[in-house]
């Protein structure tokens, strides 16, 4: 899987969208690595 910063950002955006934004406050692109997915 792509693990560039931009890929991580887009994957996280998709995850936030699917979860309705109900995730931990520190779950942001600069805090999570690709392994978080």
């Amino acid at each position: 899987a792509c693990d560039t910063a931009t890929c991580v950002t887009h994957r996280l955006a998709g995850l936030l969208s699917r979860s309705g934004g109900v995730v931990k406050n520190n779950f942001v692109p600069t805090n999570v690595g690709s392994k978080a997915f």
Epitope: C2, T4, A5, T6, C7, V28, T30, N31
Partner: antibody, heavy 119, light 107 residues
């Protein structure tokens, strides 16, 4: 609203250094990566690198590695790109850009900073 | 580095026309391609990410498709503000790379 505001145009001599700033507002600066992109006159776009404002981590394009340094000052939500040992082919517009998710999911770019290398 | 080749480099069209721009990658980049529109003297403006998703506020006349090595941007009905340069970018691998651009001119 999200904004990336860059420092003004610079004229610098060959061999010198330049430091361009990019002040972010309207979002949490440390949450999103900051990218830097070069556009020489009449040319295409060239990615320089990115910086993680949360921990200062960087990725650099090998073409610029050793001459470029990307840093941040989180206290003033500002990213910096310093380019050293300037040559005439460094004459270009330099952009900062960041993809945010909150408050809006978008790829924002600064207005650009023209750096002219001339003796 | 991944090379992105756009075609055509120049395109003449009229308001209301449907146009398609192609971006070919030298290696498989999955769906990890973005499209930008740039007007002279201005910063690029993001249109599409992940090959086919429009950013918020981008008109529905813009659509993207493709995966792997071949991608397309289609504008279904050209508006006056669409005459500009269109650029693809891959972000699947470092360093990110851009296509050379397609300049869309008024016929």
């Amino acid at each position: 609203q999200v904004q990336l505001v860059q420092s003004g145009a610079e004229v610098v001599k060959p061999g010198a250094s330049v430091k361009v700033s990019c002040k972010a507002s309207g979002y949490t600066f440390t949450d999103y990566y900051m990218n830097w992109v070069k556009q020489a006159p009449g040319q295409g776009l060239e990615w320089i690198g990115d910086v993680n404002p949360n921990n200062g981590g960087t990725h650099y394009n090998q073409k610029f590695k050793g001459r470029v340094t990307l840093t941040v000052d989180t206290s003033i939500s500002t990213a910096y790109m310093e380019l050293s040992r300037l040559r005439s082919d460094d004459t270009a517009v330099y952009y900062c850009a960041s993809i945010t998710i909150v408050p809006v999911y978008f790829d924002f770019w600064g207005q650009g900073t023209l750096v002219t290398v001339s003796s | 580095d991944i090379q992105l080749t756009q075609s055509p480099s120049f395109l003449s069209a009229s308001v209301g026309d449907r146009v398609t721009i192609t971006c070919k990658a030298s290696q498989n980049v999955g769906p990890n391609v973005a499209w930008y529109r740039q007007k002279p003297g201005k910063a690029p403006k993001a249109l599409i990410y992940s090959a086919s998703y429009r950013y918020s506020g981008v008109p529905s006349r813009f659509s993207g498709s493709g995966s792997g090595t071949e991608f397309t941007l289609t504008i279904s009905s050209l508006q006056p503000e669409d005459f500009a340069t269109y650029i693809c970018q891959q972000y699947n691998y470092y360093p990110y790379t851009f296509g050379q651009g397609t300049k869309l001119e008024i016929k």
